[in-house]
Structures are given as structure tokens and as C-alpha cells.
Amino acid sequence: APISSHCRLDKSNFQQPYITNRTFMLAKEASLADNNTDVRLIGEKLFHGVSMSERCYLMKQVLNFTLEEVLFPQSDRFQPYMQEVVPFLARLSNRLSTCHIEGDDLHIQRNVQKLKDTVKKLGESGEIKAIGELDLLFMSLRNACI
């Protein structure tokens, strides 16, 4: 089971109208540039076989991947939203840095790896898709970690 006291984010992180609006605006801008509507990165399958108590840890993995492999490489795009949203998400990632899981997390890594593989397979359009799903990332983090 996760070390649950560390796999928590304060509700206030998701109640800041300005940065929430910027996150959702960034997602919308990117989704307008996303031509591949048949693929969904963040959805029910991501959580398959993952208990409610493990979902924040899973979302931490997705958040870190999104920051390191998607947002940082694409940081010059979708301005001015990107320059404000990336530090916000990085702060959430930092607050989850001590969120770990005790025991086997193979089932979680397997699910996250599928998401990573899909993004990599789609190349730049996969990165755009991931940015277009930042609203879903935001909501999933909120539901899993507060």
C-alpha cells in the first residue's frame, strides 16, 4: 500500500481560479492541434487493476512523465499558458516527491508504461495529445490525491 500520508495534495492546489483556468486553456489550445481523436491517454484503462489508495501514486508517475518528456521539450509552444502552467505542475510534482508505494508496483508501472509507449509511438503528435489532456491530468490528480 502507498505511504498514504505522503500521497496527498491539499485541496487548495485545485482551487486557484487563475492557474486552473490557464491549465484548462493550455489543454484546449493543444487539443485544437490534436488530429488523433481516436486515442485517449488518460482514461479508465490507465486505472485498470489499481486500487483507489494507489491512484495518487500512479498519477504522480504520469505527472512526472508529462513534465519531463512532454512539457519541458515543448516548453516554447502554446504561450503564454505553458510558462505559467509548467511551474504550477512542477510544484505539484515536488509536493508528491515523497509519495511512494510499499511493495510491488509492477501493475502500476505497466499501466503507466502503456501511456508512455503510446506517446512515444505517436511522436510529436503524442506530446501534443498529452498537453491536450492536461485537463484530465488535473482532474485525475485532484480526485486521486486530495
Epitope: 484546449k28 479508465e44 485498470h48 484530465l136 482532474m139
Partner: antibody, heavy 119, light 107 residues
Framework: QVQLVESGGGLVKPGGSLRLSCAAS????????MSWIRQAPGKGLEWVSA????????YYADSVKGRITISRDNAKNSLYLQMNSLRAEDTAVYYC????????????WGRGTLVTVSS | DIQMTQSPSTLSASVGDRVTITCRAS??????LAWYQQKPGKAPKLLIY???SLASGVPSRFSGSGSGTDFTLTISSLQPDDFATYYC?????????FGGGTKVEIK
């Protein structure tokens, strides 16, 4: 193309039971959350229940909790609504609709099936 | 539960008119709002999702705006086919909830 066809409606006495079905085609049924929504004659829309693609999560409106059970059979591309202890206020057209996940709209709806609860 | 309040409940308009319908949520729902059109005896049809995204096949005269608690559906130039009832719906949280509907009728 996407098709949702409801069946099983009819006239039932108060306290009676009914099982509604929704046959889905034209999409990968197991990928979608499915909902039941009802509309009383001359009234607005009321969401009744939803079920996740795997069937592992279910959700109900307070007005039907304990009396209604939603289920699905992904092998048969079918959605069900078991309605027990029916009341006059359950009289409505019942629609099934699909939405990809939790944060997705109901993008396709069936034509509905009428349930009348009356003695 | 999140309450959705739609106004007006009835709206009389003429072909070519610009029509605006508003929807207010009892708490913040981000942009998780959809608009549906329903004609008598028919199932609802999705028009707008994520508050402002146009659903596939929907004419561009329909547009949506807003976020948080206040939302608007606008028909830029009303056409004969647009006389119907319109519903807003939030999908930020279960239970899903609908507004009471706005009937757009011929003046």
C-alpha cells in the same frame, strides 16, 4: 455508425419490477461509460445511473438508490437497468447514452423506451 | 449535488435573431459543461462540450462560453431548424445534473 436501441419498457403496477435493455453497436462498447437518463412526460432530463466500461464502478441518483441496479454485458454489447419497487414518479422515457469516461459528455443517445407506472 | 440553473425557461424569437441562453452551476465545474438540443419526441443531441467545443456535425452558428459557474450558449442567427428545447449539463462530478431546459419558440 453508432447505434443505441433501448427496449423493455411498458406498463407496470406500483411496486412492480421491470428490466430495461440497451443494445449497442458501431463502437467498442467496453471502452465507454454508459448512462441511463429519464424524462417524465412534459418535463426535463434527469440522470439516473452510470456504469464504467469494465463494469467495476457504478453510480446512482439519490432518487433511485436501492431500487435500481445498472449492469452491463460487454460480450453482448448490452446495458441493463433493473428497476424494482416502481413508483408513479418513475414514469418516464428512459434513454441510454454513452460517454467515453468520467469527464466526457454524453455524445450519443438512444431513442428511448417508455415506462409507465400506474395501477 | 451540483444544481444547474438555466434561464430563461422560455424564449420567443424570430428567424435570424441572435439568441443567448445562460446556465449557472451551484459550485465550480471548471469547463465540464455540455449543451444539448432536444426536439419533441426525439432524443437529445449533443451540441457543445467542454463549455465551448463544438460537437461533430453541429453548425458553427452555435457557440458556447464560460467556465467555473457561469456559462452561455449562443445561436448567432436563429434558423427554422433551431426551434427546440436546450439543456445544459455538468459532468464535473457524479451525480450528473441537467438544467431545467430552455424552450426556444417562434415569436
Amino acid at each position: 455508425q453508432v447505434q443505441l436501441v433501448e427496449s423493455g419498457g411498458g406498463l407496470v403496477k406500483p411496486g412492480g419490477s421491470l428490466r430495461l435493455s440497451c443494445a449497442a453497436s458501431g463502437f467498442t462498447f467496453s471502452d465507454y461509460y454508459m448512462s441511463w437518463i429519464r424524462q417524465a412526460p412534459g418535463k426535463g432530463l434527469e440522470w439516473v445511473s452510470a456504469i464504467s466500461g469494465s463494469g467495476g464502478s457504478t453510480y446512482y441518483a439519490d432518487s433511485v438508490k436501492g431500487r435500481i441496479t445498472i449492469s452491463r454485458d460487454n460480450a453482448k454489447n448490452s446495458l441493463y437497468l433493473q428497476m424494482n419497487s416502481l413508483r408513479a414518479e418513475d414514469t418516464a422515457v428512459y434513454y441510454c447514452a454513452r460517454g467515453l469516461w468520467v469527464w466526457d459528455p454524453l455524445d450519443y443517445w438512444g431513442r428511448g423506451t417508455l415506462v409507465t407506472v400506474s395501477s | 449535488d451540483i444544481q444547474m440553473t438555466q434561464s430563461p425557461s422560455t424564449l420567443s424569437a424570430s428567424v435570424g435573431d441572435r439568441v443567448t441562453i445562460t446556465c449557472r452551476a451551484s459550485e465550480g465545474i471548471y469547463h465540464w459543461l455540455a449543451w444539448y438540443q432536444q426536439k419533441p419526441g426525439k432524443a437529445p443531441k449533443l451540441l457543445i462540450y467542454k463549455a465551448s467545443s463544438l460537437a461533430s456535425g453541429v453548425p458553427s452558428r452555435f457557440s458556447g462560453s464560460g467556465s467555473g459557474t457561469d456559462f452561455t450558449l449562443t445561436i448567432s442567427s436563429l434558423q427554422p431548424d433551431d426551434f427546440a428545447t436546450y439543456y445544459c449539463q455538468q459532468y464535473s462530478n457524479y451525480p450528473l445534473t441537467f438544467g431545467g431546459g430552455t424552450k426556444v419558440e417562434i415569436k
